[in-house]
């Protein structure tokens, strides 16, 4: 999948654009908003009726090298009595993010953008029930 | 930057860290081509903490379209289909990396940007405190 070129008429390519070899693009990996601290709701993963755990995946040839993945703790959901209710389902919620992959071909190195699907948490859903003949 | 394992036979001058600026192939390696969450599942409607999806579009960003979740209710849907306000619908937020055109409007020059998106909602049992 290619990154679309800027096609809007009011987006005239400025003179200041850096020269880029064909088939590639220039990417600055100094992240905008890198140090912005987000106030996330504390402990929602353990207070949710569809609780989840986190696992950190590490890959030194990826930027960022750390990606956190969530896994639902239960198949069902936790009811008001704190028991698992199998008539409901805990399901993962996923979101795509971009990473930069570094590839070694002999002694030369190339960089590739990659979309990664991250499981960010879980939600409790009513299952769709089908009765099979 | 992050340390990269080097092929032992390569010259020592190779930088172990990711350089600040890299040239990247225009093709994105990706098997997950469906970026519209409405098409990928109907969890947003079937959840006990349902949410609406709002389209956020920015031509200076890749991907230019990002879907933002907004919880439909303050509480959660109970077994009778009513909203139970003793429970909370809470957004699940995630920091993701996107590409920002830099300088602006340039077709093939980008910078990574970290943004916070609400991906969906989950139902939470709050701990209750009675304020004296």
């Amino acid at each position: 999948r290619k990154i679309p070129k800027v096609g809007h008429t009011f987006f005239q390519k400025p003179e200041s654009c850096p020269p880029v070899p064909g088939g590639s693009m220039k990417l600055d990996i100094g992240i905008i908003n890198e140090n912005q601290r987000v106030s996330m709701s504390r402990n929602i993963e353990s207070r949710s009726t569809s609780p989840w755990n986190y696992t950190v995946t590490w890959d030194p040839n990826r930027y960022p090298s750390e990606v956190v993945q969530a896994q639902c703790r239960n198949l069902g959901c936790i009811n008001a009595q704190g028991k698992e209710d199998i008539s409901m389902n805990s399901v993962p919620i996923q979101q795509e993010t971009l990473v930069v992959r570094r590839k070694h071909q002999g002694c030369s190195v190339s960089f590739q953008l990659e979309k990664v699907l991250v499981t960010v948490g879980c939600t409790c859903v009513t299952p769709v029930i089908h009765h099979v003949q | 930057g992050i340390t990269i394992p080097r092929n032992p036979g390569c010259p020592n001058s190779e930088d172990k860290n990711f350089p600040r600026t890299v040239m990247v192939n225009l093709n994105i390696h990706n098997r997950n081509t469906n970026t519209n969450p409405k098409r990928s599942s109907d969890y947003y409607n079937r959840s006990t903490s349902p949410w609406n999806l709002h389209r956020n579009e920015d031509p200076e960003r890749y991907p230019s379209v990002i879907w933002e979740a907004k919880c439909r209710h303050l509480g959660c849907i109970n077994a009778d289909g009513n909203v139970d306000y003793h429970m909370n619908s809470v957004p699940i937020q995630q920091e993701i990396l996107v590409l920002r055109r830099e300088p602006p409007h340039c077709p093939n020059s980008f910078r990574l940007e970290k943004i916070l998106v609400s991906v969906g909602c989950t139902c939470v049992t709050p701990i209750v405190h009675h304020v004296a």
Partner: nanobody, 116 residues
Framework: EVQLVESGGGSVQAGDSLRLSCAAS????????FGWFRQTPGKEREFVAG????????EYANSVKGRFTISRDNAKNTVDLQMDSLKPEDTAVYYC?????????WGQGTQVTVSS
């Protein structure tokens, strides 16, 4: 620690109006929503109205829709409940609720009495 100060309760005639206020102080950061429940003797506390902090989305119990209006002041961490066209069945103790997603704080309550 979080403090909630409720005010504005009292006794009125049916058809009159009252305005309840609730101010939060202390470590009231990351507010999810702010609102009001009410309780009459022998009954469970019921939700009246709530306002989400991030986008001012409001929700009301069917019994008060069109008569009650909830509003907030972000800068002051306050929420107001404007109660119009009051009915005798609105008589209850009204509790302010501050919700921080995983933790919820209840105020001490303020009495509202509506006589016919």
């Amino acid at each position: 620690e979080v403090q909630l100060v409720e005010s504005g309760g009292g006794s009125v005639q049916a058809g009159d109006s009252l305005r309840l206020s609730c101010a939060a102080s202390g470590r009231a950061s990351s507010i999810n929503w702010f609102g009001w429940f009410r309780q009459t003797p022998g009954k469970e506390r019921e939700f009246v109205a709530g306002i989400r902090w991030s986008d001012a989305y409001t929700e009301y119990a069917n019994s008060v829709k069109g008569r009650f209006t909830i509003s907030r002041d972000n800068a002051k961490n306050t929420v107001d409940l404007q109660m119009d066209s009051l009915k005798p069945e609105d008589t209850a103790v009204y509790y302010c609720v501050l919700d921080l997603s995983t933790v919820r704080y209840w105020g001490q309550g303020t009495q509202v009495t509506v006589s016919s």
